[in-house]
């Protein structure tokens, strides 16, 4: 058993049929010594008396809010949560496996630039009695500070018969050094509590590996005289690191119709303009990627050919 | 050329060669993102590699003030990786595929380090650690980690030279 926060404790249980469970001793936070009784949740049934209460925690029915009273007055609470371990593996029932970029990916994180600011998100099908707490650091043995905000519900989607909820959190490294080569990864730890179930999820990454620039901005077309070609120009996204002579991007320019199966024109460039062939009912799209490190491409920025 | 006395390097040549290094480092190990190497006890193997750190003057302001600190750091790293790529880790079993770009990568590291420091000038170089894994699978894992680390190192070096070529070239 360990303390998650004040008056909230996590009991780690090996979860299998007829498991013996864990013996837990609760102590009432009071100078009083006599006349103390214990109850669980809303029940008025007295579970025991005395300053301490010893219980055998085996299942969710044994978890919950234990309260010690004296003469009708509440002295203190202890909330017991369960953390299940099945076949040596901690349960991951609360969050959905996003399976990208690999199986058992519960947390996904992205950064728009090298400033040390990043966003992580996760998915669940649970809509109520759900809380998250996020901590982060650079490195684990001698951790350097990363400050994370509160996790918020950022999107709701319908997937078949189920509703899916996306939560996200923004974090910022306290003393970021955008130009340096990272040697210690960022660690992100999410505590998830659903009713009386506790789970924790972790992710470890370098900012450079989660970079995904915003799409290029201000796409403009200029038809070339006596030609099917148009010159398309764009600018670096506002959110990208500066100066651009140092933090350079490379671009992919593509002309394509509505369908992915249609024919296309495609060219890669380090410049902020390119010449392509425009077709009726097609769109010109441009996306960006770090020029020197193969992290994710941005989403496409598009303008119609006409 | 960057010499210990402090003259400027051939920024444009360094830019071209460092960008080539980036391409080669990724073609030597393109699927690196699909393998979480941090789960494999990283510390004792690649913590010894020289990293370009915050105080090394490789940021745009540091380069403007005095590029020599940064160039010396990059030179140290190039020599270090050049030795690693020529070591038993890469030459031993399992043999590299004949079409592996590691050979080109090795030559390009040497080429860039020579551009930075011509014959007859000597900057301090970092001692190469004795990483000699006994098992072929350990060697394979170590190669992945070294190439992964090299990708990050040459990305910073390429940014430095691109910025230098754009803003510091005479």
């Amino acid at each position: 058993i360990w303390e998650l926060k004040k008056d909230v404790y996590v009991v780690e249980l090996d979860w299998y049929p007829d498991a013996p469970g864990e013996m837990v001793v609760l102590t009432c936070d009071t100078p009083e010594e006599d006349g103390i009784t214990w109850t669980l949740d809303q029940s008025s049934e007295v579970l025991g008396s005395g300053k301490t209460l010893t219980i055998q925690v085996k299942e969710f029915g044994d978890a919950g809010q234990y309260t010690c009273h004296k003469g009708g007055e509440v002295l203190s609470h202890s909330l017991l949560l369960l953390h299940k371990k099945e076949d040596g593996i901690w349960s991951t029932d609360i969050l959905k496996d996003q399976k990208e970029p690999k199986n058992k990916t519960f947390l996904r994180c992205e950064a728009k630039n090298y400033s040390g600011r990043f966003t992580c998100w996760w998915l669940t099908t649970i809509s109520t009695d759900l809380t998250f707490s996020v901590k982060s650091s650079r490195g684990s043995s001698d951790p350097q500070g990363v400050t994370c905000g509160a996790a918020t519900l950022s999107a709701e989607r319908v997937r078949g018969d189920n509703k899916e909820y996306e939560y996200s959190v923004e974090c910022q490294e306290d003393s970021a050094c955008p130009a340096a080569e990272e040697s210690l990864p960022i660690e992100v730890m999410v505590d998830a509590v659903h009713k009386l179930k506790y789970e924790n999820y972790t992710s470890s990454f370098f900012i450079r590996d989660i970079i995904k620039p915003d799409p290029p901005k201000n796409l403009q077309l200029k038809p070339l005289k006596n030609s099917r070609q148009v010159e398309v120009s764009w600018e670096y996204p506002d959110t990208w690191s500066t100066p651009h002579s140092y933090f350079s991007l490379t671009f992919c320019v593509q002309v394509q119709g509505k369908s992915k199966r249609e024919k296309k024109d495609r060219v890669f460039t380090d410049k902020t303009s390119a010449t392509v062939i425009c077709r009726k009912n097609a769109s010109i799209s441009v996306r960006a990627q770090d020029r020197y490190y193969s992290s994710s491409w941005s989403e496409w920025a598009s303008v119609p050919c006409s | 050329r960057a010499v210990p006395g402090g003259s400027s390097p051939a920024w444009t040549q360094c830019q071209q060669l460092s960008q080539k290094l980036c391409t080669l480092a990724w073609s030597a190990h393109p699927l690196v993102g699909h393998m979480d190497l941090r789960e494999e006890g990283d510390e004792e193997t690649t913590n010894d590699v020289p990293h370009i750190q915050c105080g090394d003057g490789c940021d745009p302001q540091g380069l403007r003030d005095n590029s020599q600190f940064c160039l010396q750091r990059i030179h140290q790293g190039l020599i270090f990786y050049e030795k690693l790529l020529g070591s038993d880790i890469f030459t031993g079993e399992p043999s590299l595929l004949p079409d592996s770009p590691v050979g080109q990568l090795h030559a390009s590291l040497l080429g860039l380090s020579q551009l930075l420091q011509p014959e007859g000038h000597h900057w301090e170089t970092q001692q190469i650690p004795s990483l000699s894994p006994s098992q072929p699978w350990q060697r394979l894992l170590l190669r992945f980690k070294i190439l992964r680390s090299l990708q990050a190192f040459v990305a910073v070096a390429a940014r430095v030279f691109a910025h230098g070529a754009a803003t510091l070239s005479p």
Epitope: R261, K263, K264, R266, V267, T269, T275, K280 | -
Partner: antibody, heavy 118, light 107 residues
Framework: QVQLVQSGAEVKKPGASVKVSCKAS????????LHWVRQAPGRGLEWMGW????????EYAPKFQGRVTMTTDTSTSTAYMELRSLRSDDTAVYYC???????????WGQGTMVTVSS | EIVMTQSPATLSVSPGERATLSCRAS??????LHWYQQKPGQAPRLLIY???QSISGIPARFSGSGSGTEFTLTISSLQSEDFAVYYC?????????FGGGTKVEIK
């Protein structure tokens, strides 16, 4: 499978014109760009231009501008390349080539030998 | 127009050996570079597109690398059917241009 079959060899006199055909099969004709590339004996490859069979749009290499015309007949899935004012240095194998991507060549015809000789 | 230069013009290699072919562009072309193989009396065949992307059906011994102005086609272990002429082609801008070719012949 995607296939391009070209017309047979031609012998032409200097100053004449030649029209080479290229019949496509195995795909929807308008779904691919069509290019013409030539190769003089013992020499390298030279791009001449492209046509979009969907709308007849063309782009020619400056070297052939004014002397070449590329057309298509969607009813027969056939592309044509006409080269006028032939000179002896136009002697070459002429290839048609196609791709869904405009700028490189995925599928090639077998080639048509055009000899220009007096 | 962009001039593509291939070297060497002829490469003599023994079967089973590795062959490295070079292609240089007269200006930076990012990764807009494609490789073809041509055997005598046949049309060219696409091997690699956008510098390093492999084509299904092309043996894995063919690989491409490079960006900017310098590109390499590597054939890791030459088979008898690989003796041919190899061309690079840039698609950075029109007109599309080819290199002069490298003939890979049996040593």
């Amino acid at each position: 499978q995607v296939q391009l079959v070209q017309s047979g060899a031609e012998v032409k006199k200097p100053g004449a014109s030649v029209k080479v055909s290229c019949k496509a099969s195995g795909y929807t004709f308008t779904d691919y760009y069509l290019h013409w590339v030539r190769q003089a004996p013992g020499r390298g490859l030279e791009w001449m231009g492209w046509i979009d069979p969907e709308n007849g749009d063309t782009e020619y290499a400056p070297k052939f501008q004014g002397r070449v015309t590329m057309t298509t007949d969607t009813s027969t899935s056939t592309a044509y390349m006409e080269l006028r004012s032939l000179r002896s240095d136009d002697t070459a194998v002429y290839y048609c080539a196609a791709n869904k991507e405009l700028r490189y060549f995925d599928v090639w015809g077998q080639g048509t030998m055009v000899t220009v000789s007096s | 127009e962009i001039v593509m230069t291939q070297s060497p013009a002829t490469l003599s290699v023994s079967p089973g050996e590795r062959a490295t072919l070079s292609c240089r562009a007269s200006q930076s072309i990012s990764i807009n570079l494609h490789w073809y193989q041509q055997k005598p009396g046949q049309a060219p065949r696409l091997l690699i597109y956008f510098a390093s992307q492999s084509i299904s059906g092309i043996p894995a011994r063919f690989s491409g690398s490079g960006s900017g102005t310098e590109f390499t086609l590597t054939i890791s272990s030459l088979q008898s059917e690989d003796f041919a002429v190899y061309y690079c082609q840039q698609s950075n801008s029109f007109p599309l241009t080819f290199g002069g070719g490298t003939k890979v012949e049996i040593k």
